[in-house]
Interface confidence: medium
């Protein structure tokens, strides 16, 4: 069966995606299954329908059942169900097992907690974290976007985290709170925003008309292995083989480099032939992985051959 | 890879493939070959992007830990037509996401077996 398990606390906002997917021109009709009651789609009801969406604001205890999706288009029917559980709220701090999200994990350098289901909701910063219910404060906690980043992750960091945000429907405002465990890996190795070694930024390279030219782009990006890291070269904000100059190839550096223990990649960006256009364009160096991207610019000038007259 | 099994048609089955040893993966990804078919491209990830083939779009989703360094393959509601040996492969950023030809490293595989 296309079932999906959803939960949610009483007098907080519940929205839930049909497990069925269709495009969004498909009309999906929602049912409460023990009644086989449609779900009306006016936006003045407490509990209603938007869609692939079952907005619950807010959810009640009652309100627990099982719904059923039809997702219709002109050639089929699809159908899935939704257990929906809305539990009362806790009046001590814990959180109960039934209440809690997958796990995620972190290590010393790098730590990421993402809000569970946030993106089905209609909210705006600012997003608030609690760790064992007390309010996360200070300058190692960072809420980003839909997640929350620990700089300088310790062991003492492990617990259950809760995201808090405002989800507004048609300028009513509505709770919503969801929790999830941390745990931290001890790890030797670690990785961290991409480091640019080579070129410097806005380096000038002196080049000669006619000649060939090699720009070399270095970056590390840890210690050990390194998941999802890349060095490459683009040409006016375009990469190079989308740029469809034949002259200008840019190739792999012959190994990736561990000195000192670092992770690092080279690439070096190969231009036959140099020619006056050439030094009007702009050289990106870029070096990304999953903390993000660094780019450094570099620029050609002409390089005036030795004068050998007398 | 591991996380493989046998489901009923609209089930789920969550795969992982955990990176190890000195190397950078620049984008990894998951194929999977059905018997006496091609190798083909499943779900792709870099470091910035996302990619799925048209088949599976809306029903599997791709995911990265980097603390973990393991790639994840979550398959909701599957079909028949999704059984397969699931190849995790790693490959260079700047190739063809779809070609096999450009993913230098591989798993063993993972079988996934779909019954109506």
């Known amino acids: 069966k296309f079932s999906k398990q959803s939960w949610g606390l009483e007098n907080e906002a519940l929205i839930v995606r049909c497990p069925r997917q269709g495009k969004p021109s498909y009309t999906v009709d929602w049912y409460y299954s023990q009644t086989n009651k449609s779900i009306p789609t006016q936006e003045r009801n407490r509990v209603f329908a938007s869609g692939q969406l079952l907005k619950f604001l807010p959810a009640a205890v009652a309100d627990s059942g099982i719904y059923t999706c039809i997702v219709r288009s002109p050639t089929f029917n699809r159908t899935g169900y939704a257990n929906v559980t809305i539990y009362k709220k806790q009046s001590d701090c814990n959180v109960p097992d039934y209440l809690m999200y997958s796990t995620v994990s972190g290590s010393e350098k790098n730590s990421k907690i993402y809000c569970p289901t946030i993106d089905l909701y209609n909210w705006t910063a600012p997003l608030e974290w609690f760790k064992n219910c007390q309010a996360l404060q200070g300058s190692r906690y960072r809420a980003h976007k839909s997640f929350l980043v620990i700089d300088n992750v310790m062991t003492e960091d492990a617990g259950d985290y809760t995201c808090k945000f405002i989800h507004n429907e048609n300028g009513a405002n509505y709770s919503v709170t969801a929790t999830r465990s941390f745990t931290v890996k001890d790890e030797q190795g670690f990785s961290l925003f991409p480091v640019i070694g080579a070129p410097a930024q806005n380096e000038i390279k002196e080049v000669e008309i006619g000649k060939n030219a090699n720009l070399t782009c270095s970056a590390c990006f840890g210690k050990g292995t390194q998941f999802l890291a890349a060095v490459l070269w683009q040409l006016n904000g375009t990469k190079i083989t989308d740029f469809g100059e034949p002259r200008i190839q840019q190739e792999e550096g012959q190994n990736q480099s561990f000195s000192n223990g670092l992770a690092c990649l080279d690439m070096v960006l190969r231009i036959a032939d140099v020619k006056e256009e050439d030094l009007l364009l702009q050289y990106d160096c870029l070096a990304l992985n999953l903390h993000g991207l660094r780019r450094h610019t570099v620029r050609l000038s002409r390089k005036n051959p030795i004068d050998h007259h007398s | 890879e591991s996380g493989g099994g046998s489901v009923q048609a609209g089930g789920s089955l969550r795969l992982s493939c955990a990176a190890s040893?000195?190397?950078?993966?620049?984008?990894m990804g998951w194929f999977r070959q059905a018997p006496g078919k091609e190798r083909e491209g499943v779900a792709m990830a870099s470091a910035i992007s996302e990619d799925y083939a048209d088949s599976v779009k809306g029903r599997f989703s791709i995911s990265r830990d980097s603390a973990k360094n393991t790639l994840y393959l979550q398959m909701n509601s599957l079909k028949p037509e999704d059984t397969g040996m699931y190849y995790c492969?790693?490959?260079?950023?700047?190739?063809?996401?779809?070609?096999?030809?450009?993913?230098?490293?591989w798993g063993q595989g993972t079988q996934v077996t779909v019954s109506s």
């Open positions: 040893g000195y190397t950078i993966n620049y984008r």
């Open positions: 492969a790693a490959g260079r950023v700047w190739g063809r996401l779809w070609n096999p030809d450009d993913y230098n490293s």
